[in-house]
């Protein structure tokens, strides 16, 4: 099969303030071995939103069980969305390395926009 692709199937997602936002991401292959991370923004100033390998991300839950063998779905849900969460989110696959994992491939990004909370 072809080399791994990182697929973010939605270009944009719009969520009302206070709701949860689901950001979808899938891989097409289990190879190479290594974790995935979610970032808001791109480049040096990007903000880490979720790291599959380590860290505490209280507002983030994974849609499927990432520890499940052969899992390829790395979608996340972010709770209690506020206007400050607006931006473009990237799902990024890393290749296992020593001492550090190496960025392998990024999805095309999903733009999250936040609507005013319904009155």
């Amino acid at each position: 099969e072809d080399e791994l692709q990182v697929i973010q199937p939605e270009k944009s997602v719009s969520v009302a303030a206070g709701e949860s936002a689901t950001l979808r991401c899938a891989m097409t292959s289990l190879i190479p071995v290594g974790p995935i991370m979610w970032f808001r923004g791109a480049g040096a100033g990007r903000e880490l939103i979720y790291n599959q390998k380590e860290g505490h991300f209280p507002r983030v839950t994974t849609v499927s069980e990432l520890t499940k063998r052969n899992n390829l779905d790395f979608s996340i849900s972010i709770s209690n969305i506020t206007p400050a969460d607006a931006g473009t989110y990237y799902c990024v696959k890393f290749r296992k390395g020593s001492p550090d994992d190496v960025e392998f491939k990024s999805g095309a990004g999903t733009e999250l926009s936040v609507r005013a909370k319904p009155s």
């Epitope: 199937p9 944009s12 719009s14 891989m27 097409t28 292959s29 499927s64 390829l72 609507r115």
Partner: antibody, heavy 121, light 110 residues
Framework: DVQLVESGGAVVRPGESLRLSCKAS????????MSWVRQAPGEGLEWVSG????????YYADSVKGRFTISRDNSESTLYLQMNSLRAEDTAVYYC??????????????WGLGTLVTVSS | ALTQPASVSANLGGTVKITCSGG??????????YGWYQQKSPGSAPVILI????KRPSDIPSRFSGSTSGSTTTLTITGVQAEDEAVYFC??????????FGAGTTLTVL
Amino acid sequence: DVQLVESGGAVVRPGESLRLSCKASGFTFTNFAMSWVRQAPGEGLEWVSGISGSDDTTYYADSVKGRFTISRDNSESTLYLQMNSLRAEDTAVYYCVKDSTVSWNTFFDYWGLGTLVTVSS
Amino acid sequence: ALTQPASVSANLGGTVKITCSGGYGSDDGSSSYYGWYQQKSPGSAPVILIYWDDKRPSDIPSRFSGSTSGSTTTLTITGVQAEDEAVYFCGTYDTSSGAIFGAGTTLTVL
């Protein structure tokens, strides 16, 4: 080479049931969602139902909800469509299709040759 | 629903554009990608030409290209061949429900 081979099409009467099968080969079956798409005579394409490869989540078009059931046997690389309470408007060629992602019904990069279901009294 | 013209025609060797508009999500600001399928005859298996708006499978000739602006996607065939005479369906999807197709555009090569 990816291959999708459908079977089970037949002529049935309204209200009867039928089960379609699709044997897949040439790719890692569990890594991809699968769907059924149909085409009535002289008409366009209609997505019918899909099933995720990651957790067996199922999806249905409103026109078949409650009557059709999609399932998959990953050990046999086989996709099924159980069709109950068939109607004349279900008459179509049914295509088994492979999705390009694991979890959703997005783009269908491989199609079977189709199997014809005719519902007629 | 997706809206596309019922028919278009093109001269052999010419260029033709087929447009498709609509889809899921345009009301609330969410949006998905578009794709295109070719069906050479009724009842024959469709073939994917374009997916993720502009990606072309490796076995599809480079004369087929896709582009999307807002909620309108366009399939362009540059240097139309006789064998391109077919019905072309656009498609999109909603990840929480399913896929949808346009009604199809018949291309006639003159």
